[in-house]
């Protein structure tokens, strides 16, 4: 009785269970009653990352420098190349097929998390007591100046975009 299902790492062909090719290898010929499955390792810049019956290996991803990409990890016969972005850029998707410049946090917002090759800048609004007066991809919200520690008084209140303005204490007051 010919099999209708095969074990793990096997496939059914011509009423027969044949061994799949291991990762990094492609199928050259199916097994027969007398011979085993024939496989061949993937060639240069090719890979297969699963047990398979593919007759062609996949091409390694190309990290196109024109799109701001560079190689983070070179591919092997069993793994694809991993791309990342050049300095100052980050991937537009998880598969990292192109790059865009990191966003800057506008005045009133500070950097919560600096961008990486795969993630954009994360900004946060400056809370009360903090400010940012620049557009930056690196600067966090800074605390308002403490006039008291300088024996000064607040002449102008700070905002999320401006620091407080300190001035001398009024000597008239007792």
């Amino acid at each position: 009785e010919p099999p209708t299902a095969c074990r793990e790492k096997q496939y059914l062909i011509n009423s027969q269970c044949c061994s799949l090719c291991q990762p990094g290898q492609k199928l050259v010929s199916d097994c027969t009653e007398f011979t085993e499955t024939e496989c061949l390792p993937c060639g240069e810049s090719e890979f297969l990352d699963t047990w398979n019956r593919e007759t062609r290996c996949h091409q390694h991803k190309y990290c196109d420098p024109n799109l701001g990409l560079r190689v983070q990890q070179k591919g092997t016969s069993e793994t694809d190349t991993i791309c990342t972005c050049e300095e100052g850029l980050h991937c537009t998707s998880e598969s990292c097929e192109s790059c865009v410049p990191h966003r800057s946090c506008l005045p009133g917002f500070g950097v919560k998390q600096i961008a990486t090759g795969v993630s954009d800048t994360i900004c946060e609004p400056c809370p009360v007591g903090f400010f940012s007066n620049v557009s930056s991809a690196f600067e966090k919200c800074r605390p308002w100046t403490s006039c008291e520690t300088k024996d000064l008084v607040v002449q102008q209140a700070g905002t999320n975009k401006t620091d407080v303005v300190c001035g001398p204490q009024d000597r008239q007051r007792a």
Epitope: T32, T35, E36, E38
Partner: antibody, heavy 120, light 112 residues
């Protein structure tokens, strides 16, 4: 017990031909890939050629491509290497080696080798 | 395609451990987990000791182990014995049209 027995070596002049044979026993011959590997006197190992279990797929080192032909007769449990246009640098002990299962790039059993000398 | 690079010789005393390195390129050892190691005693046929970087065929002592890092494979023999004295060859599949390349071989001497 797996056994591989090479024959057909000898002295041959440059430009001449030889046919090596390897008689296999102790395993189901058609289920294993087979290779020829050579070793020049006092030197290291050099892979020469391989064939899949069916004999349809064949592979050659650059150094012998176009001059050597590997074949097998599964009904006779025998592997062959036809060597033409022989050169002095082909002088070596030629080993017949069994591929580990269907992987002809690993050699789990070897014959004792047959010496091929190319000299005028 | 030039051969994989192995030290010409290594030595060790009985009971010690030794490691033989095998340096290739990103086209062979670095690209494939298809590295094997062979032991050859003088006048004898080679014997498969390790395949697929670190797998031992049945019947090979667990004193023999293989590993790989980047483009360098290594064979480690622990608890050296006099019978381990032999030549050792590494081997790798390669992306070049030569398909399979060997190292130049390493002569292991067991001292004493």
């Amino acid at each position: 017990e797996v056994q591989l027995l090479e024959s057909g070596g000898g002295l041959v002049q440059p430009g001449g031909s030889l046919r090596l044979s390897c008689a296999a026993s102790g395993f189901t011959f058609s289920r294993n890939a087979m290779s020829w590997v050579r070793q020049a006197p006092g030197k290291g190992l050099e892979w020469v050629s391989a064939t899949g279990g069916s004999g349809i797929s064949t592979y050659y080192a650059d150094s012998v491509k176009g001059r050597f032909t590997i074949s097998r007769d599964n009904s006779k449990n025998t592997l062959y290497l036809q060597m033409n246009s022989l050169r002095a640098e082909d002088t070596a002990v030629y080993y017949c080696a069994r591929g580990y299962s269907n992987s002809w790039w690993y050699f789990d059993y070897w014959g004792q080798g047959t010496l091929v000398t190319v000299s005028s | 395609q030039s051969a994989l690079t192995q030290p010409a010789s290594v030595s060790g005393s009985p009971g010690q451990s030794i490691t033989i390195s095998c340096t290739g390129t990103s086209s062979d050892v670095g690209n494939y987990n298809l590295v094997s190691w062979y032991q050859q005693h003088p006048g004898k046929a080679p014997k498969l000791m390790i395949f697929e970087v670190n797998q031992r065929p049945s019947g090979v002592s667990n004193r023999f182990s293989g590993s790989k890092s980047g483009t360098t494979a290594s064979l480690t023999i622990s608890g050296l014995q006099a019978a381990d004295e032999a030549d050792y060859f590494c081997c790798s599949y390669t992306t070049s049209s030569t398909y399979v390349i060997f190292g130049g071989g390493t002569k292991l001497t067991v001292l004493g």
